[in-house]
């Protein structure tokens, strides 16, 4: 008999608002798992260190992810 699992996602609320990549301290992408069935994106802002969950389905957030990965690929040799 499988044990019943409690869903333990981090994000209680999400934001669709565009985020300036320059204002980001850190961007965490947590893949879906047995504990949380959805992808979670957590942005830590440089100013005040505020943390915010971003909507992976939002066009603005998809664009942000593209911009961040582009920036990373530029940096890597």
């Amino acid at each position: 008999v499988p044990l019943s699992r409690t869903v333990r996602c981090t994000c209680i609320s999400i934001s669709n608002q565009p985020v300036n990549p320059r204002s980001l301290e850190k961007l965490e992408i947590i893949p879906a798992s047995q504990f949380c069935p959805r992808v979670e994106i957590i942005a830590t802002m440089k100013k005040k260190g505020e943390k915010r969950c971003l909507n992976p389905e939002s066009k603005a957030i998809k664009n942000l992810l593209k911009a961040v990965s582009k920036e990373r690929s530029k940096r890597s040799p």
Epitope: T10, S13, I14, E50, K51
Partner: antibody
């Protein structure tokens, strides 16, 4: 502006059930977590439950676990609290509150509350 | 018994400074931000301070918050008669079952 209006309170006998509703307006309901908090007469605030923006994550206070169920209907912009096996100690004003939106979760806007009295 | 500990009462004369403490543990205040709520008599609670020290628009700058370790405090400077209310601290708690925890509340009286 943000508005939260609770309804469904009333007088109920111990062991019976009641369902509270909270109608939300003035913000994008489907992207915010929502909370229920209660306040017994003359007492402090007690957090009851939270539900995530999509309804997939729910957390409860130990005092209501297994008896109360939080749910939401994003198309109706409505939050619910199903209260079963009610006890006299559940007598309180029940407030719904919008989540702050950032991490960690917190509460910003509150409704005016609905009174639940559990009495025989 | 509340998870966060506040003094039950505090008082001051108009113009004075009043400070309310809120003590918690590593799983709540120690690892998360603190919010403060004001509840005027017969009214619903209202957010006064969020993220330890941020004021929502419309809240006078007489109200300020701070956090250090597992404790937080709310200061009201230039106390006014309309500040007579109950004040509650709250924080997210990352213990085995995540939850919001409140302080027991502090009744502020303006003498």
């Amino acid at each position: 502006q943000v508005q939260l209006v609770e309804s469904g309170g009333g007088v109920v006998q111990p062991g019976r059930s009641l369902r509270l509703s909270c109608a939300a307006s003035g913000f994008t309901f489907s992207t915010y977590g929502m909370h229920w908090v209660r306040q017994a007469p003359g007492k402090g605030l007690e957090w009851v439950a939270v539900i995530s923006y999509d309804g997939g994550t729910k957390y409860y206070a130990d005092s209501v676990k297994g008896r109360f169920t939080i749910s939401r209907d994003n198309s109706m912009k409505t939050l619910y609290l199903q209260m079963n096996s009610l006890r006299t100690e559940d007598t309180a004003v029940y407030y719904c509150a919008k989540d702050l939106g950032d991490l960690p979760p917190g509460l910003d806007y509150w409704g005016q509350g609905t009174m639940v009295t559990v009495s025989s | 018994q509340s998870v966060l500990t506040q003094p039950p009462s505090a008082s001051g004369t108009p113009g004075q400074r009043v400070t309310i403490s809120c003590s918690g543990s590593s799983s709540n205040i120690g690892s998360n931000t603190v919010n403060w709520y004001q509840q005027l008599p017969g009214a619903a609670p209202k957010l006064l301070i969020y993220t330890n020290n941020q004021r929502p628009s419309g809240v006078p700058d007489r109200f300020s918050g701070s956090k250090s370790g597992t404790s937080a405090s709310l200061a009201i400077s230039g106390l006014q008669s309309e500040d007579e209310a109950d004040y509650y601290c709250a924080a997210w708690d990352d213990s085995s079952e995540p939850r919001v925890v409140f302080g027991g509340g502090t009744k502020v009286t303006v003498l």
